[in-house]
């Protein structure tokens, strides 16, 4: 089955500059299929722009300016580039690639969608650093022992654009677990949001891991907000004194930094 | 120029009650074109649903059943047993790939019918009410209530910012809650919540026990910590690897 | 009005570490957008960035010096603190603090700067 | 990492518009703040976001920004003008300065 990835979730740049979108076809040989993109203008329909089939072929919607977009294909890393040039307002919209995938029965086929880069304009850089700002909350102690059961919470602030993604995975596992969130807040001209992920008294012990995907996260790799294990058994709290104990009672979190 | 039209904008449907979503075609008959019906949930995922043909997107063959009406010109999506997962915009689109002739292989889209979902009537439930806190950062967890209809206080005396709350649907068909605020006075912040004519206080439910905390952090640049050192880590980030992690006891 | 005041030794001895306080008042570092940053100038020469520290107590320092400076503030007292570890003559300057305030995504420039302390570093 | 070019000296006759550039890559795409320090003096911000005139600063002073050049514009140039002007942006909340100009009124 083919699948679609479109690694950039955001992407922000100033009026007049080119910006470049990627898809990366996989479960499929990108030579052999025609990849398809859209766009989807905020409160309009989603519109064919341009599709480049399996021979090289570029097909470009009527009423869409030549110039304007340009489509490739780059077998080697099976990914298909949306290239818009001298971008304007006019431009913003979240972009789709898409390809029709054969279904197990002969004749049958549907279109799989990517999902989506979400293309944002700005009149100027941002001045400041805008990846996502964490901060985790752990259960409280009244929650594990009253309802066998604890909720951990990422709070992620300060960042820009408001496109992000947020899903929660234990350690050494990739299920995606079932979260809540929060929507996407506006705090002066950057953004905030909160994931929170409740789990049974007996998933307390395992680490778990609040992943943020987002365009200003830095060298572009999502960012792992690690949640350590809670020993319900061992850790007890007075919620009425909460600084009052030596650091030796409770658990060291001792993080070692080998960055550059 | 054929044209999809939505029936509706907006479609509220009740966890396990049916909902019928309708898309008509303007400008054609709708028999010449296939219909297709996606699903775009938060982030912006688009889904496939169902194509004509009896072709169902993976995991929508037993909840969804697409039909067309070529009598009234319009397609149909029945969604037979709404869970809070089948919150999201649907659209409707078409194509005549594999009609031959002059086929179309581009989708040509409708606007979209934002489907919101609530939890079904029931009798109503008190909330459960708890607080996280971190450095200044103070959460207000409050769980499975129902009905919706809440109003969260975080009392303190010593205000930095509030947000307002986010109330979704619990795994359970009811609500769950949070509220965040940043207050100079964190240690001393407690919640309470007005819900069905009552009011329910975090300190309702803490348990007298006697240590800090789960985690006290050593500071690193690149880890966010709070100001003092009985808080909670802001967090510990990992970008590729740009930390090792051990805990001792 | 918005005043800044840097406070420190004016002469420390090479490898010693320098500890340099901007105590200000008119505004509040807890306050959206409102951020502190050191800048030093030596002698003749051009302006140096050296680190800021914002209100959400993020703190950025220039790549240069980052494995020298730590810069810290204590809300309640109006302060930031500057350190800088293993002092050389060459770090002979006037240390100037200033306030940034901003929007989260832009900054309206170093709009209120402190009179400076000259700090000489000599044996 | 990001740098901003300036010529050491400009000189003008009094009367006259002074004309200070900044260099640096795109700079146009970034905003630009311009500080003046008199001599034995702290800066002070005459100028912010390209063309922003902090209150108390004289409406001669004025500013713009495109393509890789900043310009601080100082018409009707007067004695108490001369100092040393320097040009800011900023990197992802780093500030950088450029190396300084001494405007000199003959």
């Known amino acids: 089955a083919g699948h679609l990835e479109q690694p950039q979730i955001s992407s922000t740049k100033t009026l007049s500059k080119t910006a470049r979108l990627e898809c990366v076809v996989s479960g499929i040989t990108i030579s052999a299929t025609s990849v398809y993109w859209y766009r989807e203008r905020p409160g309009e329909v989603i519109q064919f722009l341009v599709s480049i089939s399996y021979d090289g072929t570029v097909r470009k919607e009527s009423g869409i300016p030549s110039g304007k977009f340009e489509v490739d294909r780059i077998p080697e890393t099976s990914t298909s580039t949306l290239t818009i040039h001298n971008v304007e307002k006019q431009d913003i919209a979240t972009y789709y690639c898409a390809l029709w995938e054969a279904q197990q029965e002969l004749g049958k086929k549907i279109k799989v969608f990517g999902p989506g880069t979400k293309l944002i304009i700005t009149d100027k850089q941002l001045d400041a650093d805008v990846s996502p700002k964490p901060t985790i909350f752990l259960p409280s102690i009244a929650e594990t022992k009253l309802q066998k059961a604890g909720t951990y919470l990422c709070l992620l602030e300060k960042f820009f654009p408001d496109v992000i993604k947020i899903h929660w995975q234990e350690k050494k596992s990739n299920t995606i677990l079932g979260s809540q969130e929060g929507n996407t807040m506006k705090t002066n001209d950057t953004y905030m949001k909160f994931s929170w992920l409740t789990v049974p008294e007996k998933s307390l012990d395992k680490e778990h891991r609040c992943i943020v995907r987002h365009e200003n996260n830095k060298n572009g790799v999502d960012q792992e907000i690690i949640f350590p294990p809670i020993k319900t058994d061992v850790i007890t709290m007075d919620p009425k004194d909460n600084c009052s104990k030596d650091a030796n009672d409770t658990l060291l979190l001792q993080l070692t930094n080998t960055s550059a | 120029a054929i044209e999809l039209v939505p029936e509706h904008q907006t479609v509220p449907v009740s966890i396990g009650v049916p909902a019928t979503l309708r898309c008509s075609m303007k400008g054609e008959a709708i028999g010449n074109y296939y219909i297709n019906w996606y699903r775009k949930t938060q982030g912006n995922t688009m889904t496939f649903i169902y194509r004509e043909k009896d072709i169902y997107g993976p995991g929508f063959k037993d909840n969804f059943q697409g039909d067309i009406d070529i009598a009234k010109n319009l397609a149909v999506l029945k969604i037979l047993a709404p869970s809070e997962r089948d919150e999201g915009s649907y659209y409707c689109a078409c194509d005549t790939l594999g009609m031959g002739g002059e086929y179309t292989d581009k989708l040509i889209f409708g606007k979209g019918t934002r489907v919101t979902v609530e939890p079904r009537s029931q009798p109503h439930t008190k909330p459960s009410v708890f607080v996280m806190k971190n450095g200044t950062n103070v959460a207000c967890l409050v769980k499975e209530f129902y009905p919706k209809d809440i109003r969260i206080n975080l009392v303190s005396s010593k205000k930095i910012t509030e947000f307002d709350p986010a109330i979704v649907i619990s795994p359970s068909g009811k609500y769950n809650a949070v509220k965040l605020g940043k207050y100079e006075d964190s240690n001393s912040v407690t919640c309470s919540v007005q819900h069905d004519n009552k009011t329910v206080h975090s300190t309702d439910f803490e348990v007298k026990t006697d240590s800090t905390d789960h985690v006290k952090p050593k500071e690193t640049e690149n880890t966010k910590q709070p100001s003092k050192s009985c808080h909670k880590p802001k967090a510990i980030v990992h970008t590729e690897k740009v930390n090792m992690m051990s805990l001792t006891v | 009005q918005v005043q800044l005041q840097e406070s420190g030794p004016a002469l420390v001895k090479p490898t010693q570490t320098l500890t340099l306080t901007c105590t200000f008042s008119?505004?509040?570092?807890?306050?959206?957008?409102?951020?502190v940053s050191w800048i030093r100038q030596p002698p003749g020469k051009a302006l140096e960035w050296l680190t800021l520290?914002?209100?959400?107590?993020?703190?950025y320092y220039s790549t240069s010096l980052k494995t020298r400076l730590t810069i810290s503030k204590d809300t309640s007292k109006n302060q930031v603190v500057l350190t800088m570890t293993n002092m050389d003559p060459v770090d002979t300057a006037t240390y100037y603090c200033?306030?940034?305030?901003?929007?989260?995504?832009?900054?309206?420039?170093?709009?209120?700067w402190g009179q400076g302390t000259m700090v000489t570093v000599s044996s | 990492s990001y740098e901003l070019m300036q010529p050491p000296s400009v000189s003008v006759s009094p009367g006259q518009t002074a004309s200070i550039t900044c260099s640096g890559n795109?700079?146009?795409?970034?905003?630009a703040s311009w500080y003046q320090q008199q001599p034995g003096q702290s800066p002070v911000l005459v100028i912010y976001?390209?063309?922003k005139r902090p209150s108390g600063i004289p409406e001669r002073f004025s500013g713009s920004n495109s393509g890789n050049t900043a310009t601080l514009t100082i018409s009707g140039t007067q004695a108490m003008d001369e100092a040393d002007y320097y040009c800011?942006?900023?990197?992802?909340?780093?500030?950088?300065f450029g190396g300084g100009t001494k405007l000199t009124v003959l």
């Open positions: 795109e700079l146009g795409d970034k905003y």
């Open positions: 520290i914002d209100w959400f107590d993020d703190k």
């Open positions: 200033a306030r940034i305030r901003g929007t989260g995504a832009y900054y309206y420039g170093l709009d209120v």
């Open positions: 008119g505004f509040s570092l807890s306050s959206s957008g409102m951020c």
């Open positions: 800011q942006a900023w990197d992802s909340s780093k500030v950088v």
């Open positions: 976001q390209d063309n």
